[in-house]
């Protein structure tokens, strides 16, 4: 009679997470009459996963009935497959033996690998706020799947971009698998409603990749222009000076209002209205009483936003073009842009 | 938690045996692979002998047919018989467990065996 | 057997910095080499297996790579408890399991 032969038919099986997993194993022959034992790898590390003769293997069923006399498959069923389950299979028989069994012979092995779906991808965008026509850096990370092939796209606003850098780790097998990427995006003065898009194909998505977003609200400073104008007399000693603070993002900004250098009144965007690209504008007054400046006053709009250096913008109003009221009001009355005054 | 505990070092002459054991806890320990490892006073990591799950042995030819490995799968212990031991046979040794994939991912304290004349 | 060769014997590092650390075997491991650290008095630790695979709780400035013949363990920003005497092993061939000879991390 020919001697036994362990066939394991399939050289590699795939399976999802969470499933479960058929390792098929066959013998030719009844003889030599002894057990059968699966183990995960070979040599001194393999490890026993199912042994037909004693143990406890609460995940392992067998899929036919190992106590029939006649019976010659010895497949095995394991149940709940997590990526950890990953690695090569052998159906080993043993010969009865006293004290001990001893191997027989192998099967071949079963390349058993587990389909595992990546975590949503999470995006983080630089620690500080940057101003448009500059680079920053975005980084996109998903974790846990198996194998290890993946597709890992950017965009923004719907367009894809090109600048990125993107590695899989480990290098070597492993169980699961992370990715991790970093995109470099140029800001422009139009990018307050803008998003930024990781996208992560990946064999077991099923043609549905995962998405993870940022917002470049949160990374974008526009710094604002500044615009001071006079406005008419609004009576015979009084000039309405306004500073136009246009374009700018986020909304924290304060505002310092200078008469020949010395702060005359500081104010906090409020009533701030919304400009179609997000941006804001703001707009302050200052009434001047020329009537208490002698010379030339020099007026100047100081603007500081989000916490960066001040910028400024000044006006130079011309006393000697206004009546002098001898006696009258020294103190140059200021207002906001929502405050009445009236003398 | 896993933990490997040896025990049975010692100070012995030339020729003589000694016999080590390790108490293993914390995982199923008649599924796994142990080995032994040692490591000579100021020297590297020398493999020294294994036991399969199954109980197949494996052994480093500087120990082959003077060291046997064995393991109680009832008691969750595994064992090195020395024998002729040889003062180059002094050494640190450590029990640890084997992967599947054969590298070693949990490792005891050791036991220190000193051969001397 | 596979012989594994570790150089250099002793890297000074300064705490902070990056240290590289290479492993060369005599023939092709298909990508099963290990890496375990051990500090004086202390059984090794395994940090990463299968080339870059790192073992669980340890830290992301521990990082493996390489193929064939050539491996590298790098770690990269240097800390007081990363001293210590760091050996390859390859679990290809286990007629017999081979470590390299070992490279001690000192404090330049």
């Known amino acids: 009679e020919e001697e036994l032969q362990v066939i394991q038919p399939d050289k590699s099986v795939l399976v999802a997470a969470g499933e479960t997993a058929t390792l098929r194993c066959t013998a030719t022959s009844l003889i030599p009459v002894g057990p059968i034992q699966w183990f995960r790898g070979a040599g001194p590390g393999r490890e026993l996963i199912y042994n037909q003769k004693e143990g406890h293997f609460p995940r392992v069923t067998t899929v036919s009935d190992l106590t029939k006399r006649n019976n010659m498959d010895f497949s095995i069923r394991i149940g709940n497959i997590t990526p950890a389950d990953a690695g090569t299979y052998y159906c080993v028989k043993f010969r009865k033996g006293s004290p001990d069994d001893v191997e027989f012979k192998s099967g071949a092995g079963t390349e058993l690998s587990v389909r595992a779906k990546p975590s949503a991808p999470v995006v983080s965008g630089p620690a500080a706020r940057a101003t448009p026509q500059h680079t920053v850096s975005f980084t996109c990370e998903s974790h846990g799947f198996s194998p290890r092939d993946i597709t890992l796209k950017w965009f923004k606003n719907g367009n894809e971009l090109s600048d990125f850098q993107t590695n899989v780790d480990p290098v070597g097998e492993s169980v699961s698998y992370s990715i991790h990427s970093t995109a470099k995006v140029v800001l422009t003065r139009e990018d307050v409603h803008s998003q930024v898009i990781c996208e992560v194909a990946h064999v077991t998505l099923q043609g549905d990749p995962l998405r993870g977003t940022a917002n470049l609200s949160e990374t974008i400073r526009v710094p604002p222009t500044l615009e001071v104008t006079q406005q008419p007399v609004r009576a015979e000693n009084q000039v309405n000076v306004t500073c136009q603070v246009r374009k700018f993002y986020p909304q924290r900004l304060q505002l310092t209002w200078l008469e020949n250098g010395n702060v005359s009144r500081t104010e906090t965007a409020s009533t701030v209205t919304e400009n179609k690209d997000g941006t804001y504008n703001w707009m302050s007054w200052l009434l001047v009483n020329v009537s208490a400046h002698r010379d030339d006053v020099k007026l100047t709009c100081q603007v500081e936003h989000d916490g960066q250096p001040a910028v400024s913008k000044s006006h130079d109003l011309k006393v000697s073009a206004h009546p002098k009221e001898q006696g009258s009001n020294t103190a140059a009355e200021n207002t906001g842009s929502n405050e009445r005054n009236i003398y | 938690d896993v933990q490997l505990v040896e025990s049975g070092g010692g100070v012995v002459r030339p020729g003589e045996s000694l016999r080590l054991s390790c108490a293993a806890s914390?995982?199923?320990?008649?599924?796994?692979?142990m080995s032994w490892v040692r490591q000579a006073p100021g020297e590297g990591l020398e493999w020294v002998s294994a036991?399969?799950?199954?109980?197949?042995?494996y052994y480093a030819d500087s120990v082959k047919g003077r060291f046997t490995i064995s393991r109680d799968n009832s008691k969750n212990t595994l064992y090195l018989q020395m024998n002729s031991l040889r003062a180059e046979d002094t050494a640190i040794y450590y029990c640890?467990?084997?992967?599947?994939?054969?590298?070693?991912?949990?490792w005891g304290l050791g036991t220190l065996v000193t051969v001397s004349s | 057997e596979i012989v594994l060769a570790q150089s250099p014997d002793t890297l000074s590092v300064s705490p902070g910095e990056r240290a590289t650390l290479t492993c060369r075997a005599s023939?092709?491991?298909?990508?099963?080499l290990a890496w375990y650290q051990q500090k004086p008095g202390q059984a090794p630790r395994l940090l990463i297996h299968?080339?870059?695979s790192r073992a669980d709780g340890i830290p992301a400035r521990f990082s493996g790579s390489g193929s064939g013949t050539e491996f590298t363990l790098t770690i990269t920003g240097l800390q007081s408890e990363d001293f210590a005497v760091y050996y390859c092993?390859?679990?290809?061939?286990?007629?017999?399991?081979?470590f390299g000879g070992g490279t001690k991390v000192e404090i330049k």
């Open positions: 640890a467990k084997v992967t599947w994939n054969n590298f070693f991912d949990y």
């Open positions: 023939q092709d491991v298909a990508g099963k």
């Open positions: 914390g995982f199923t320990f008649r599924n796994y692979g």
């Open positions: 299968a080339t870059s």
């Open positions: 092993q390859q679990h290809y061939d286990w007629s017999p399991l081979t």
């Open positions: 036991s399969s799950g199954s109980g197949s042995t």
